[in-house]
């Protein structure tokens, strides 16, 4: 499955939207900094089957979508930018869905390293718990916004490697 070129553009637009969403300086939130233990190894792997890599990318985008579509999120961010973010993420999910399904049916269900999916899920659990503990404060959201940008940057690298494999 070839990820359409629009997927890369969508990824870039998502990064730009996340950057535009910034409401306060991260420097004013230094006391709220947190290590979410991003599962970098799940994004470095050249050992990945293509289907698995696509599933991991899908999980990141799906969890990001869920994170930013909560009631607490709609209070924290500019609604116009949030709507644009939803549109971009939704389009990327559609692109990846088609690819996952294609990879599944090409050779039967490929063996998926379920631990990769779990690692991503746990990462977003840590983010969710952090927001809960910080009572969804503006600084907490700012820290999370910056963290999501970081995770998207890493997933972009994985996408590029996927494209080179095609």
């Amino acid at each position: 499955c070839d990820l359409p070129q629009t997927h890369s553009l969508g990824h870039r637009r998502t990064m730009m939207l996340l950057a535009q969403m910034r409401r306060i300086s991260l420097f004013s939130c230094l006391k709220d900094r947190h290590d979410f233990r991003f599962p970098q190894e799940e994004f470095d792997g050249n050992q990945f089957q293509k289907a698995e890599a696509i599933s991991v990318l899908h999980e990141v985008i799906q969890q990001t979508f869920n994170l930013f579509s909560t009631k607490d999120s709609s209070v924290a961010w500019d609604e116009r930018l949030l709507d644009k973010l939803y549109t971009e993420l939704y389009q990327q999910l559609n692109d990846l869905e088609a690819c996952v399904m294609q990879e599944v049916w090409v050779g039967g269900t490929p063996l998926m390293n379920e631990d990769s999916i779990l690692a991503v899920r746990k990462y977003f659990q840590r983010i969710t718990l952090y927001l809960t503990e910080k009572k969804y404060s503006p600084c907490a959201w700012e820290v999370v916004r910056a963290e999501i940008m970081r995770s998207f940057s890493s997933s972009r690298n994985l996408q590029e490697r996927l494209r080179r494999k095609e």
Partner: antibody, heavy 119, light 108 residues
């Protein structure tokens, strides 16, 4: 509000298959993994596996690998759990439970479907 | 597979008393992924506590959770008649996800 509605009770003979459905409403169906958990009479809870309704990928507990098949129909927001080669030990209440994160993990359950395996 | 062992199997107490339920894991479980559920006869389980110590929505403050590593505890500070049920601990720290065998809390 989130609702998970399961199909009715089933009686099956050993060796047969059963297919239980779970219809979701009140949220975006494709955004959350759906899990299946079973409970034999008077026993504890046992996780069987999960499906991502968005693309249909599944993760099964080793114990059920080869006997369980989880599928979904996005047009009706329904997930299915099929268990084959039934034996008497498969007599149980089967629940679907929605995944999520933090306070949303297994916060929503179906009402349960009793499957009785008897000759 | 992480085996969760709950004790005691049955706990007989009176309303107003304090209940302490234990959950012991066969190997270490990150506290973020340890949950507690309550189940009454004929009903589906109900989420009580998430990530070891956080109260789920609508759960009374008499319920609390604690622990880390391999030992976790659910405490009910003063039992109400509606608290008599079966309680399960659950982990999703690693596949396959598992539940304890349950502790039945019954009226003395």
């Amino acid at each position: 509000q989130v609702q998970l509605v399961q199909s009715g009770a089933e009686v099956k003979k050993p060796g047969a298959s059963v297919k239980v459905s779970c219809k979701a409403s009140g949220y975006t169906f494709t955004n959350y993994w759906m899990h299946w958990v079973r409970q034999a009479p008077g026993q504890g809870l046992e996780w069987m596996g999960e499906i991502n309704p968005s693309h249909g990928r599944t993760i099964y507990a080793q114990k059920f690998q080869g006997r369980v098949t989880m599928t979904r129909d996005t047009s009706t927001s329904t997930v299915y759990m099929e268990l084959s080669s039934l034996r008497s030990e498969d007599t149980a209440v089967y629940y679907c439970a929605r995944g999520g994160l933090g306070p949303a993990w297994f916060a929503y359950w179906g009402q349960g479907t009793l499957v009785t395996v008897s000759s | 597979e992480i085996v969760l062992t709950q004790s005691p199997a049955t706990l007989s107490l009176s309303p107003g008393e304090r209940a302490t339920l234990s959950c012991s894991a066969g190997s270490s479980v990150d506290s973020s992924y340890l949950y507690w559920y309550q189940q009454k006869p004929g009903q589906a389980p109900r989420l009580l506590i998430y990530s070891t110590s956080n109260l789920a929505s609508g759960i009374p403050a008499r319920f609390s959770g604690s622990g880390s590593g391999t030992d976790f505890t659910l405490t009910i500070s003063s039992l109400e008649p509606e608290d008599f049920a079966v309680y399960y601990c659950h982990q999703w720290s690693s596949y396959p996800f598992t539940f304890g065998q349950g502790t039945k809390l019954e009226i003395k």
